[in-house]
């Protein structure tokens, strides 16, 4: 029971974490103009990864899209491909957790196999919480860079009479969806990876059958026996004989130290 | 068709305030702003603040202790409160339309007010 | 506030004949984040309201005929009539719509012979 609860929070707090990685990507607020200690002006300017957008007090929102590929800076290129690449491992770690559930049940999937598609998930659903949030992170870092550098230069070169107002940007909305949806995503995925361990059998799992004397009650079960989840008949416990033997399964189940991880 | 009609005209003894309501039609108070704008005899223009869509307001700083704008949306109203008024304080009043770049693109035919005893 | 100088503040012309009138800000009225400067040239006829000519120092407002044109940018802004008609008498304002308070300059009389 835990298992599968571990499971599916882990599903759930992912696909929560890859919306807000989806959002954050979208959203155009990731540098907001700085209005403190700024002289106060009629017109807000906030830039996505996308585009730049200017809000005017009349109420008009104008937005312009980067329609240059070269001419962008390497460092918005490489928040953009570690934004795009989290996106797409959390989706492929989406597609793949779906049907690693314990509760959905696909054919005669093995547990071995569904532990192997947790993991694979939790991983990527790791590796896309990282993508997200080194992503973020970088774009943070050049933020505080240009904000100081732009700082430096509100104080210079101001020996005439006209005076050129800077405009800083600092943290947009985005950011901290970014850092939060990440964070997310990487929990989801830590919890699949512990799932995993709960669905995965601990040694080879061998058909134990149970043979039926004529005159006597007694079982005998030959080697290890499989380590069950707890939750019912299994989907591959097939009889193997119509007359006395059974698969161990069908005569009882055993609860494991798995269930109550 | 985009409209603004300011109440009015108005006889002020100095010292007493002023009420002036700005009535809009073809456009609504929650997507654009509206500006005031005054113009005593023979001068030029001079801006009075403005109320922007989300209800904010921005005042010219040598008017703001006496100055005060506000809008009833439902109604499409927005009103410009003035106390202590002053004998130079006699002009016309015009309420606008924000536009694009702040630009003020419709104006109303402005209202005469007198500060005189 | 924002200060804004017009030049020359009368200007008497024949029909016909180019004019230029000027407008200086105090500080540059240049929005980087659109490259669009924010100021405004309005027309104000004898006994009427002001009315729109020009926004974002050089966009038409619909309706203008094209003899009118803004240029200029930072601080340095100018309004050009190409060839000035009997109709144009009037005064020409500018307008910082960039730094709040708004601030209009002391306008440009056109006066034609």
């Known amino acids: 029971m835990a298992v599968t609860a571990c499971q599916g929070l882990g599903f759930v707090v992912s696909l929560i974490g890859i919306a807000g990685i989806i959002a954050a990507t979208c959203m155009d607020q990731w540098s907001t103009q700085d209005l403190y200690n700024n002289p106060v002006t009629a017109v807000f300017n906030y830039q996505g990864l996308w585009r730049s957008c200017v809000r005017e007090s009349s109420g008009f929102t104008e937005c312009r899209g980067y329609f240059t590929l070269l001419g962008l800076p390497a460092m918005l290129q490489a928040v953009r491909a570690l934004m795009i690449v989290g996106i797409v491992l959390g989706a492929i770690g989406l597609l793949v957790s779906i049907f690693a559930l314990k509760c959905i049940r696909i054919g005669s999937m093995e547990d071995s196999a569904k532990a192997n598609m947790t993991l694979t998930s939790g991983i990527m659903f790791i590796v896309s919480g990282l993508c997200a949030i080194a992503g973020v992170s970088v774009f943070a870092n050049m933020l505080v860079t240009n904000f100081w550098m732009s700082t430096a230069n509100m104080y210079t070169g101001m020996g005439g009479m006209v005076q050129t107002v800077q405009t800083r940007y600092t943290f947009g909305a985005a950011l901290f969806v970014g850092w939060v949806a990440g964070g997310l995503t990487l929990i989801g995925g830590v919890m699949m990876c512990i799932a995993c361990r709960g669905l995965a059998p601990e040694e080879t799992n061998y058909k134990a059958v149970s043979y039926h004397a004529s005159g006597h009650s007694v079982a005998y079960k030959p080697g290890g026996f499989k380590a069950s989840t707890g939750f019912g008949s299994n989907t591959k416990n097939k009889k193997i004989y119509d007359g006395g033997a059974r698969t161990e399964d069908e005569v009882q189940s055993y609860p494991s130290k798995h269930d109550y991880v | 068709q985009v409209q603004l009609k300011e109440s009015g005209p108005v006889l002020v003894a100095p010292s007493q305030s002023l009420s002036i309501t700005c009535t809009v039609s073809?456009?609504?108070?929650?997507?654009?702003?509206v500006q005031w704008v005054r113009q005593p005899p023979g001068k030029g223009l001079e801006w009075l603040g403005a109320?922007?869509?989300?209800?904010?307001?921005n005042y010219n700083s040598a008017l703001m202790s006496r100055l005060s704008i506000s809008k009833d949306n439902s109604k499409s109203q927005v009103f410009l409160k003035m106390n202590s008024l002053q004998t130079d304080d006699t002009a016309i009043y015009y309420c606008?339309?924000?536009?694009?770049?702040?630009?003020?693109?419709?104006w109303g035919q402005g209202t005469s007010v007198t500060v005189a005893s | 506030d924002i200060v804004m100088t017009q030049s020359p503040s009368s200007l008497t012309v024949t029909a016909g004949e180019r004019v230029t009138m000027s407008c200086k800000s105090s500080?540059?009225?240049?929005?980087?984040?659109?490259?669009?400067?924010?100021l405004t040239w309005y027309q104000q006829k004898s006994g009427q309201p002001p009315k729109l000519l020009i926004y974002?120092?050089?966009t038409r407002e619909s309706g203008v005929p094209d003899r009118f044109t803004g240029s200029g940018s930072g601080t340095d802004f100018t309004l050009t009539i190409s060839s000035v008609q009997a109709e144009d008498l009037a005064v020409y304002y500018c307008?910082?719509?960039?730094?709040?308070?708004?601030?209009f300059g002391s306008g440009t009389k056109l006066e034609i012979k």
């Open positions: 606008a339309k924000g536009g694009y770049g702040n630009a003020m693109d419709y």
């Open positions: 974002w120092a050089s």
């Open positions: 500080q540059s009225l240049l929005n980087s984040g659109n490259q669009k400067n924010y």
């Open positions: 073809g456009f609504s108070l929650t997507t654009y702003g």
């Open positions: 307008q910082n719509d960039y730094f709040f308070p708004f601030t």
């Open positions: 109320i922007w869509a989300g209800g904010n307001t």
